[in-house]
């Protein structure tokens, strides 16, 4: 990007440059028209028969530098051939010589600063690469030259450029005095500002466009070159805030529109709210959940919001005893999430109606709470209780919903208590064909003991046919029939009014061989 | 000799035309940029209208735009005025004027008049 | 556009300087050219630039122009000086000239 000091073809008025000295032969300022018919100012000189170390001098006016350490400084100008011109004599030149001269302030004057080199600093002696012919009463003709030169460093409040001419017939056409500098410059959503470059290189802080944040690493920078150009390098740059994405060639953040969110900073645009939120305002970093929609936690931002699924559905309920097994069907609703887990909540009901939640010596398998499969196994129900249970489904936003939580709920009844299992059989006789046996009272919880059940069979004939059954009102039996020096395996149970009891264990009785050992008491 | 010579002036009616003329001579016509000048009886003078040198770019004051013409034909050496629709302010003498030369270069012109004319009057009058 | 006004009228004795003036908005930024005129001749150019001299114009007549104030300076003046004097300079439009009223100098 150039930046113009000075540019005589813009200047309407005149220019009234110093000349000096005051002799015949200076330089003259002319005008004229440009392409687009505007007055244009020039200075011409043509004073090819001066004297010997005559020299004419032509100073612009005090410029201001702007900051600018390199200056340049482009003439158009045109050069007559000495050749050209009849009274030329020796002292003709085809060169003029450019310098310049600094000062913090416009305090030059006809006669200061001295006119020659040192205090003027010489920037180049300039030679034409085109000369213009004349012939008498022809028109000139000949190209225009155009030569930039350098000037600087500089370090005062603003300089003079002046134009030294020796002997030549030219004209200066056109001066532009001009800085190069960095334009502004927005990459990666990083803005460098405009920068005048002071060295041949300038390492240029960089800061993040409005909405975007610093990205992870080094803060970003870029080099702004002597020539105007910033040097190629990768820039680590910004990223838009969260709610907001990269826009027009990542120069800008864009607040992301309704509807949309950005959960992060970074790369990535904004995205469609997720299921059950919205977001009704612009530049979203997050979208709110729909009333009765939640998300967890542990829940990524830009998650869907989920709702507490709904009851468990179908609990099927088998009892055995003082166990129970409950199962039923997945709830209807998950409500969008897959970390579905069931609870069970208990009541018991005494015969006498008296209800509470359940005691502790319930045992639930594999647990009350946190079941990922849907059944569980009630151990250590107390006979002739009503226990409801309540199923729910819950899920990772459960805890955020206020109100009831759906569930299944299931009544179960277990029986009154049935008699224990008789154990302590004892053969108190035993002949070749009979067993009696007599045991010992179970005490029952539920009421007397009605009457009992004797199940007996020859050891090693398995089949239910050779099984045999004998009730008894009393605590003993006789067992007839049976054959000679045969082993049997008996086993005894008792009823009450809450039903049959458990079997016991096998007893293991054996029949007398012969007749005449007679009836024996025989002690268990 | 380098002169410029007017003629044309006389007498109109107003709303009338002229043209005047301007023949040049000892000097390259076609290198100089021209200007009209006038001056009212007994005022000062007044700039009308420039030309530049190859004719292609003219210039006027306020007072004449619309109503009067310059032109040149280099290849006669005559600077010329037409004037249409003459008021009776218009009367004055009129000079022809050369805008002082450049070296060489008949793009450019310096700001001052270095040559006249003797003029010649134009009377507006019914 | 700029305007320029001068005295209508200087009055200077013979060996005397005259000054004649010419003021207008930062004329000292323009150049100002001086024009002699004598009764029924055409102008004639005295001063160009400010400050310089044509060729054939005596060495008394000489120029300045700063601030808002040209100034044409005649030192010795002399009876055949006595003429109007008008100054010029660039108007606002595209080559387009402007004069002052002029200032008759009387050589007393």
């Known amino acids: 990007l150039e930046e113009t000091l000075l540019n005589t073809k813009l200047e309407t008025a005149d220019l009234k440059w110093v000349t000096f000295p005051q002799v015949d032969g200076q330089w003259e300022e002319l005008s004229g028209l440009d392409e687009e018919q505007h007055s244009v100012r020039t200075y011409e000189v043509c004073d090819v028969q001066r004297a010997p170390g005559q020299a004419h001098w032509l100073r612009t006016g005090w410029v201001p530098r702007r900051g600018a350490v390199h200056v340049y400084a482009t003439l158009r100008f045109t050069m007559l051939e000495c050749l050209s011109l009849p009274r030329a004599g020796r002292s003709c030149k085809e060169t003029f010589t450019v310098f310049y001269y600094e000062s913090d302030a416009d305090t030059a004057t006809a006669l200061t600063p001295a006119w020659m080199e040192n205090p003027y600093i010489k920037v180049d002696t300039v030679a034409a690469e085109h000369l213009t012919r004349k012939r008498p009463g022809a028109e000139a003709t000949g190209k225009v030259n155009v030569k930039t030169l350098r000037l600087g460093p500089l370090s005062k409040a603003g300089f003079y450029l002046a134009f030294q001419d020796q002997g030549a017939c030219m004209a200066l056409l056109s001066l532009h005095l001009f800085y190069k500098k960095c334009a502004q410059l927005t990459v990666n959503l990083t803005r460098f500002p405009e920068t005048v470059p002071r060295e041949l290189v300038v390492p240029v802080a960089g800061s993040c466009v409005v909405d975007a944040v610093p990205a992870p690493g080094p803060s970003p920078s870029l080099y702004c070159r002597e020539d105007g150009q910033w040097a190629e390098q990768p820039v680590t740059g910004c990223s838009c805030a969260p709610g907001f994405e990269a826009a027009e060639g990542n120069t800008k953040c864009r607040a992301c529109a309704q509807g949309t969110f950005k959960p992060l900073s970074g790369e990535g645009s904004c995205q469609p709210c997720p299921a059950n939120s919205h977001s009704n305002t612009i530049g979203s970093a997050v979208c709110q959940c729909r009333v009765g929609y939640f998300r967890a936690r542990t829940d990524p931002r830009g998650a869907p919001c989920t709702t507490p699924p709904s009851a468990p559905r179908s609990v099927v309920s088998r009892l055995n005893g003082s166990s129970l097994h409950l199962e039923w069907s997945a709830p209807l609703e998950s409500g969008g999430r897959e970390d579905l887990t069931y609870a069970l909540r208990c009541r018991e009901c005494r015969p006498g109606g008296s209800c509470a939640p359940c005691g502790g010596d319930l045992t639930f398998d594999p647990g009350p709470r946190d079941l990922v499969e849907p059944w569980v196994v009630v151990r250590g129900l107390r006979p002739d209780f009503t226990y409801t249970f309540e199923v729910t489904a819950l899920n990772g936003v459960s805890s955020l919903a206020t109100g009831p939580v759906p569930f299944e709920p299931v009544n179960v009844t277990t029986d009154r208590e049935v008699p224990p299992a008789v154990s302590d059989i004892r053969v108190t006789r035993s002949s070749p064909s009979s067993l009696s046996l007599a045991w010992a009272v179970p005490r029952a919880p539920s009421g007397a003991v009605l009457d009992y059940e004797v199940k007996y069979h020859e050891k090693g004939a398995e089949g239910p046919s050779s099984v045999r059954f004998l009730k008894t009102s009393e605590n003993r039996a006789e067992l007839r029939g049976l054959k000679r020096g045969a082993s049997y395996l008996v086993q005894v149970r008792a009823r009450s009014e809450a039903g049959y009891g458990p079997f016991g264990q096998e007893h293991h009785s054996q029949t007398q061989l012969d007749e005449s050992e007679g009836w024996r008491e025989q002690l268990a | 000799q380098v002169e410029l010579v007017e003629s044309g002036g006389g007498l109109v009616q107003p709303g009338g035309s002229l043209r005047l003329s301007c023949a040049a001579s000892g000097f390259t016509f076609n290198n100089a940029w021209m200007s009209w000048v006038r001056q009212a009886p007994g005022k000062g003078l007044e700039w009308v209208s420039a030309i530049n040198a190859k004719g292609q770019f003219t210039s006027y004051a306020d007072s004449v735009k619309g109503r009067f013409t310059i032109s040149r034909d280099n290849s006669k050496n005559t600077l010329y005025l037409q004037m249409n629709s003459l008021r009776a302010e218009d009367t004055a003498v009129y000079y022809c004027?050369?805008?002082?030369?450049?070296?060489?270069?008949?793009?450019?012109?310096?700001?001052?008049?270095?040559?006249w004319g003797q003029g010649t009057l134009v009377t507006v009058s019914s | 556009d700029i305007e320029l006004t001068q005295p209508p009228s200087v009055s200077v004795a013979p060996g005397q300087t005259a000054r004649i003036s010419c003021s207008g908005d930062?004329?000292?930024?323009?150049?100002v050219h001086w024009y002699q005129q004598k009764p029924g001749q055409a102008p004639v150019l005295v001063i160009y630039?400010?400050?310089k001299r044509p060729s054939g114009i005596p060495e008394r007549f000489s120029g300045s122009n700063s601030g808002n104030t040209a100034t044409l300076t005649i030192s010795g003046t002399q009876a055949e000086d006595e003429a109007d004097y008008y100054c010029?300079?660039?108007?606002?439009?595209?080559?387009?000239?402007?004069f002052g009223g002029g200032t008759k100098l009387t050589v007393l």
């Open positions: 010029q300079a660039w108007g606002a439009g595209s080559h387009q000239m402007v």
């Open positions: 004027a050369r805008k002082g030369m450049s070296f060489y270069n008949n793009k450019y012109a310096k700001s001052m008049f270095d040559l």
């Open positions: 930062n004329l000292g930024k323009k150049y």
């Open positions: 630039y400010d400050s």
